[in-house]
């Protein structure tokens, strides 16, 4: 237990260089007073008093132990914390450090909530925006398309910057930037819709900085299951922020008497959060939590990073699987409320809708379900993975694969149930989304396993780019297109409006199954890619000058 406390403290953010250096010295076991025993998870190596960095690599969801060639492995001593308490080894305060890192993770998660809150506030007041600017549905759709496109383009750029420059400064600047732009956009006159479109594009750039860099900071603040937990909290911010965005949009509009005020809430909170990030988030070093000794060598070129990522099969397959999740969530989020409304029209429990938004009630229910299943999915995914890790080293991708394949079944059942029972359809949505969302944090986990710390921001960015490009950037349009295509070849009736959209949405479970296959493929290469990443980390670590190797 003492060792665990010590490990968690030592893995903390490097607020001060001296404390950091001190911790490194302690990790190497080089102090005379340490009596040849090393603390915090690193095994002491007889006589020599040197602990090689490649003995234990802490990843998101557990430490991976390996025995260095020619050296015997000595288990960590339960009383190792006490051994470190010599005059030459001042003990860091675990509680305060832990609290500091916890606060940092909380602030980063809050920032993620605000990112999504801002994104979906616009969705919550979309009808007002259309009426204010007098634009068509496609004009309103342009707001989301421009956002996603700029987000996609900006993500790799911020990935590059995030692996090379001060991350918390980039984060804060990103938040300040999108907050200022969103706030300004609430004052755009009705004749200048193109300015609103431009502003959403700029917001996409600002938010890309956050989404690509924040997870990597969490990755450097925590290890083992704590990192899984913190990333779970971070990714739960997605459904929470999205749901709150809808609610904020409509409720602020009601309370303030005008929809423009809805666009002024998240910027104010954003400015506060950006400031808190600057103050409370430590300037962690890349790979800080993964390193047990030494300093990371100079960074590689962006081109070399990209080549390495493209050759990393686990990364490529898990990114393709993430795209499948994105495809399904994008399409279902857009069309399920309307589909359920049409189902009710067929069942004669609702009137034919002549004035959208059709299925406004269904949108609210669906939003609430998404919010809750997001939380439930992240928690069950992390829990299932933790349990399965005791049985197999391939737990992460396998849990994701099972979740995806199970989700596909329940998504299929939505269309069966909707014909006769809306409640049944909602139950299928609930289970299907829970399973679908169960892989959010685990996918980030897989990335942290198979990608070296100095490439993580680039990896997150590229994964984000791919999942939007192949996923939610096109899926809502594609489903609408297929639905229209089916309707053109059938007679004009409420039944066929319902069926055509249902048949089009059937593409989602197929894509989800494909995503499950990609996760199974990830499982095939996972162990070898993880070993490669660990080996690369060791090669990247400069041995301490005072130690001969």
């Amino acid at each position: 237990m003492m060792c665990l406390e010590c490990a968690s403290a030592a893995a903390g953010g490097a607020e001060e260089e001296e404390a950091d250096a001190e911790r490194r010295r302690r990790r190497r076991g080089a102090q005379p007073g340490a009596g040849g025993s090393a603390c915090c998870g690193a095994r002491g190596v007889g006589g020599a008093g040197v602990v090689s960095a490649d003995e234990e690599v802490q990843t998101l969801s557990g430490s991976v132990r390996r025995v260095p060639s020619g050296l015997p492995s000595i288990p960590s001593t339960p009383g190792c914390a006490a051994a470190a308490k010599g005059p030459s080894a001042p003990q860091p305060k675990p509680a305060s450090l832990g609290r500091g890192r916890g606060a940092a993770a909380a602030i980063l998660s809050l920032g993620n909530v605000l990112n999504y809150l801002d994104r979906y506030t616009v969705a919550g007041v979309l009808l007002d925006i259309q009426q204010h600017f007098g634009v068509k549905d496609r004009g309103a759709g342009l707001l989301q398309s421009v956002f996603i496109c700029s987000f996609m383009v900006a993500a790799p750029i911020f990935g590059y910057l995030g692996d090379r420059f001060n991350r918390k400064v980039i984060l804060s600047c990103g938040i300040f930037f999108w907050s200022a732009v969103t706030f300004s956009s609430s004052f755009i006159p009705q004749q200048y819709f193109w300015l609103l479109v431009l502003s959403r594009g700029l917001v996409g750039i600002g938010e890309a900085s956050y989404s690509t860099i924040a997870p990597t900071i969490i990755g450097d603040l925590f290890t083992k299951n704590t990192r899984t937990l913190m990333l779970s909290v971070f990714y739960f911010a997605i459904p929470l922020g999205s749901g709150l965005g809808y609610i904020t949009g409509s409720s602020v509009k009601q309370a303030a008497g005008d929809w423009h005020w809805a666009l002024r809430v998240s910027p104010v909170l954003g400015m506060i959060t950006g400031t808190l990030i600057l103050i409370l988030v430590p300037a962690t070093k890349r790979g800080h939590a993964d390193q047990l000794g030494g300093q990371l060598k100079a960074r590689t070129s962006w081109l070399r990073d990209m080549k390495a990522l493209i050759r990393n099969r686990s990364y490529v397959f898990s990114s393709l699987a993430t795209s499948a999740v994105s495809f399904a969530t994008g399409a279902l989020g857009m069309w399920i409320p309307l589909y359920l409304h049409r189902a009710q029209v067929v069942q004669k429990t609702a009137e034919t809708c002549n004035s959208p938004p059709c299925g406004a009630k269904d949108s609210l229910i669906f939003g609430a379900i998404t919010c809750f299943t997001g939380f439930l999915g992240v928690v069950t995914g992390a829990g299932a993975t933790r349990w399965c890790r005791l049985r197999t080293q391939r737990a992460d991708p396998l849990v994701c694969a099972v979740g995806m394949l199970g989700s596909a079944i329940f998504i299929c059942l939505i269309f069966v149930a909707a014909k006769t029972s809306i409640v049944g359809a909602y139950i299928c949505i609930f289970v299907g989304e829970t399973l679908l969302f169960s892989n959010w944090a685990i996918t980030a986990d897989i990335l942290m396993y198979v990608v070296i710390p100095t490439r993580r921001a680039t990896a997150v960015a590229l994964q984000s780019f791919t999942s939007h490009l192949l996923g939610d950037a096109g899926s809502p349009y594609l489903i609408g297109f297929i639905s229209d295509l089916i309707r053109q070849s059938t007679k004009d009736s409420p039944l066929w409006e319902f069926l055509s959209l249902g048949y089009a949405l059937m593409l989602c479970p197929f894509v989800v199954v494909l995503g499950g296959m990609f996760f199974l493929a990830t499982a095939l290469f996972f162990l070898s890619d993880r070993a490669k990443a660990e080996q690369q980390v060791n090669q990247l670590v400069m041995p301490p000058a005072s130690v001969k190797v």
């Epitope: 009808l127 068509k136 009705q190 509009k253 009601q254 303030a256 005008d258 929809w259 959208p356």
Partner: antibody
Framework: EVHLVESGGGLVQPGRSMKLSCTAS????????MAWVRQAPTKGLEWVAS????????YYRDSVKGRFTISRDNTGNTLYLQMDSLRSEDTATYYC????????WGQGVMVTVSS | QFVLTQPNSVSTNLGSTVKLSCRRS????????VNWYRQHEGRSPTTMIY?????PDGVPNRFSGSIDRSSNSALLTINNVRPEDEAYYFC?????????FGGGTKLTVL
């Protein structure tokens, strides 16, 4: 079913004031921008004023700016048009309208400005 | 701000097809929705087409709306014209929250 019912029209002298009301039913009133449209005898339709969902933003045609005030009461599902400093050219049938999505019109109320 | 121009009057024969046009003076006709209203003498307007091409319930499928990008116009097509179609037809579009109306076309059925 959507219903818009105007009231408050009649004969008024130039320079005087008049207030028109429009009671809405059959749809979520506070989701929609609303407008007043008028039609002078033997003339076409002419937009007069419109108001945002919460009433915070109002728009007027140049000829009525500063004289007419559009407002709404979302709790009572009612739209208003306060007309001050009326002129003879304001004589028309005034329609309350929801012009977004599927537009709906009231039956209209006649306002005659004459001495 | 743009202007919507409609022909003052159009005459057509009973049972034939007629196209009523509504030309936008500046900006793309496709940028904003176009609605079409019919008004019989002494009555309030009723919506015949909204959102460019959508028919409300109760409007016969003889009526259809379309956008002609080449002439930057919206078109209201009435097939198999009937005596009750004789009325004024107004087109309307949006410039932000300002509603722009065409001058109206008087359709006469011969």
């Amino acid at each position: 079913e959507v219903h818009l019912v105007e009231s408050g029209g009649g004969l008024v002298q130039p320079g005087r004031s008049m207030k028109l009301s429009c009671t809405a039913s059959g749809f979520t009133f506070n989701n929609y921008y609303m407008a007043w449209v008028r039609q002078a005898p033997t003339k076409g339709l002419e937009w007069v004023a419109s108001i945002s969902t919460g009433g915070g933003y109002t728009y007027y045609r140049d000829s009525v700016k500063g004289r007419f005030t559009i407002s709404r009461d979302n709790t009572g599902n009612t739209l208003y048009l306060q007309m001050d400093s009326l002129r003879s050219e304001d004589t028309a049938t005034y329609y309350c309208a929801r012009c977004w999505e599927l537009p709906y019109w009231g039956q209209g109320v006649m306002v005659t400005v004459s001495s | 701000q743009f202007v919507l121009t409609q022909p003052n009057s159009v005459s057509t024969n009973l049972g034939s097809t007629v196209k009523l046009s509504c030309r936008r003076s500046s900006g793309n006709i496709g940028n904003n929705y176009v609605n079409w209203y019919r008004q019989h003498e002494g009555r309030s307007p009723t919506t015949m087409i909204y959102r460019d091409d959508t028919r409300p319930d109760g409007v016969p499928n003889r009526f259809s709306g379309s956008i002609d990008r080449s002439s930057n116009s919206a078109l209201l097509t009435i097939n198999n014209v009937r005596p009750e179609d004789e009325a004024y037809y107004f087109c309307q579009s949006y410039s932000g929250s300002i509603y722009i109306f065409g001058g109206g076309t008087k359709l006469t059925v011969l």
